[in-house]
Each structure stands twice: as C-alpha cells, then as structure tokens.
C-alpha cells in the first residue's frame, strides 16, 4: 500500500494502527474512544451531549358529548374527522394553555359512544438533570386540567354552551411514556472496556463523560508534571524526566534531583 508518509519506518505505520484504527493513506483514522498517531491513546472525554429536549407522551381517552358519532369520523382523511380534529385541538390548547411543557394533541382513534377520543397529549421540556421531575409534574397538571374541564363542560338539556362538552366519567389516562435519557448509562456504554473509570460530571447543567485524565473536574487526577494515561487497569500517571529532576510516585509528586543522585553515585564509586 503506497502512502504519503515520510520518514523511517513509515511504510509500516499503516499496519500499526491500533485499537481498530484505519489507515487513510496519510494517517490513522481512530475510532471514537482513541486518538494519537497510532490510535494508542484513550480519550479522556466522550461526547454524550444530551438531546436538546426530552419528550413525554400521555395516552388519554375522553368522551365528547357535544358531537354525535358518524361513521365518517373513523376515516382520518374525511372532512368530518378534520373538522373534529380542529375543534378538539383548539379546545385542548385552551385546556392546557398554562402548561409550558405542552406541545399539542394527536388523535389516534375516534369511536362510538357519543365520540370517544383516544389521543396522545405531547409534552416536551429542555434537557436538564431534573427533566424527569419537570415532566412528572407536567403530567400531573395535565390530569388535573382534563379532569376539571370534563367535569365542568357538560351538556345541559342535550345542549352544550362550550366549544366542546364531555362525559365526566369517560376520562381515562391509559399510559405515560417519557423518552429515557440516562447519561451515566450512555457514558458507561461509550467508554466500553474503560467504563469503570469514566464518570458523568455536570457543568452548567450539561453532562460530561470524563475519565480522571480530563483536567478541570472534581474527579480529575493531578499528575503534576506527568501525563495522565488511561489503561485497562485505570488511570495512571506517566512521570517525566527533566534536565534536572526525575519524577516518581503515583501522582509524579516526588522529585529527585539528578545532581544529588549522580553525586551519591560518584561518592560511591
């Protein structure tokens, strides 16, 4: 394989890409978890950027009494269905207007019984670590509001004075589904065999998947003048040697002056 790499041992570089790296003719293209000339280094930070928003879906049933059921309502492309959908959506937009997480409603099925409306209430919130609580609270408010409106907007003498009237006993919440986002789980998965050493830390409410080799976080390992390197046995400090000192110790914090060592040796000899 010809390459545009120059220098000694260059022709072997292609076959030396490590950790699943692939040679592109110029350099090793590394998979997400690795970097370096030969993909030999493990990254210290993995992007697990959360979705901008998290959604929830509530499956509800309400019974509308101010519209009489006709067969055409079963057909979602009929004019009847479209008009019903328009009125129902407007009514629900009013009902849920005070809920910031409310996005809209989606009718899944209309069936006989006055008009039994099977529908989804769609909720959405910006991602924060507290998104579950936010959406849980929103679903509770949805339940309160739909229960209230279906109790208050009722037919009197077969006549409705509101945009829509309901059967008080026909309101049911079938199911609530929240989009699951678990940064810790994502972090562990993406870190693969290094999963035990990567953790999630938050900054400005955003999760960061980091190893102790990533500086600036509470779990960061201080290698002083050394370099933090990840291995399968965990993060380790690779200590440096300067012109004047050798550094050693778990965090490279023990410096030994070379002159003292050399002096000792000369004395010894």
């Amino acid at each position: 394989r010809t390459t545009t790499c120059f220098g000694d041992g260059c022709q072997n570089t292609a076959s030396r890409c490590k950790n699943g790296g692939t040679w592109d003719g110029l350099k090793c293209q590394c998979p997400n978890l690795y970097y370096g000339e030969l993909c030999e280094e493990v990254v210290s930070s993995i992007d697990i950027g959360p979705p901008e928003t998290i959604s929830a879906q509530m499956e509800l049933t309400v019974t509308v009494t101010s519209v009489k059921f006709t067969e055409e309502l079963k057909n979602h492309s009929s004019q009847e269905f479209q008009e019903f959908k328009q009125t129902f959506t407007e009514q629900m937009n009013i009902v849920y207007s005070g809920i910031p997480e409310y996005v809209g409603v989606n009718i899944t099925k209309l069936r006989l019984g006055s008009v039994v409306v099977e529908h989804d209430v769609l909720l959405r919130t910006k991602y924060t670590p507290e998104y579950k609580t936010v959406l849980d609270n929103a679903t509770e408010v949805v339940k309160e509001k739909i229960t209230k409106v279906t109790t208050q907007q009722i037919m009197i003498n077969d006549i409705c004075s509101d945009m829509m009237c309901f059967n008080t006993t026909g309101t049911q919440v079938q199911n609530i589904t929240v989009t699951q986002y678990d940064p810790e789980e994502d972090c562990r998965k993406m870190a693969k065999e290094y999963g035990d050493y990567f953790v999630v830390e938050y900054r400005d409410q955003k999760p960061y998947c980091i190893s102790p080799c990533e500086p600036g976080f509470s779990v960061s390992k201080n290698c002083n003048l050394g370099k933090c390197q990840m291995s399968l046995s965990g993060p380790q400090c690779l200590c440096v040697t300067t012109e004047t000192h050798w550094y050693s110790g778990e965090t490279c914090n023990q410096g030994t002056q070379k002159s003292l060592v050399y002096g000792h040796h000369h004395h010894h000899h």
Partner: nanobody, 123 residues
C-alpha cells in the same frame, strides 16, 4: 371549499317579518349541522336557531315561537323565517355550518361562516 352566502336582510318595522336565506356550496348539504347566529353591536355572537341532519333543532328562548329554521336539501339552502320582529332582534345575522352533527351553541365549534346580513327592526 365551503361557501355560505346570506341574503334577505333589511329594515323592517316592529311586528313585521323577514325571511333570511343561506345558499351553500362546497359540501353535501344533507350532512352535518346548520345554524343562524346573530351579533348585535357591542355584544357577543349568539346562537339563534340550529338544525342537525339527525333532526335535532334548537331555538334561543328569546325567539321561540317567532322564528323557524328550515332547509331545502334540493336547493342547498338554509332559511330563517322571522315573524313578530322586535327592536332587540336588530343585529347582523350569520349563517353557520359544520359537517359534524353538533349539539353546541358556541360559535367556536362551528367551522364555516357566511359574511352576514344586517337586520334592522325600527319604526
């Protein structure tokens, strides 16, 4: 596209009569619900008389016994016969329609509207 065009409005003396018509085009006239609403100056739009394809009819208490709603499916036309007119009947009268079989007086539930015809009852 549904179109409703009212006619028959005008000036009439108290105790007089008028017949409003609403010519419809754009969907099957025999389906759904039809109605007459009115709006007096400075007041909200209110239901006067409603009729549905299943035979249900409604009249506002203030017009019961004086107004009659009817329709002619062959002509796709809705009518409002107004007798014994009073000064308080003065308003713009609107024809409304929906393909749904409605039981509601609330104008927000009605999807199709005419442009309105003025009825003035004055001596």
């Amino acid at each position: 596209e549904v179109q409703l065009v009212e006619s028959g409005g005008g000036v009439v003396q108290p105790g007089g009569s008028l017949r409003l018509s609403c010519a419809a085009s754009g969907f099957t006239f025999s389906r759904g619900s039809w109605g007459w609403f009115r709006q007096a100056p400075g007041k909200e739009r209110e239901a006067v008389a409603l009729i549905s394809s299943d035979g249900w009819t409604f009249y506002a208490d203030s017009v019961k016994g004086r107004f009659t709603i009817s329709r002619d499916n062959s002509k796709n036309t809705l009518y409002l016969q107004m007798n014994s007119l009073r000064a308080e009947d003065t308003a713009v009268y609107y024809c409304a329609a929906s393909v749904l079989v409605l039981r509601t007086l609330n104008p927000k539930a009605w999807h199709h509207w005419g442009q309105g015809t003025m009825v003035t009852v004055s001596s």
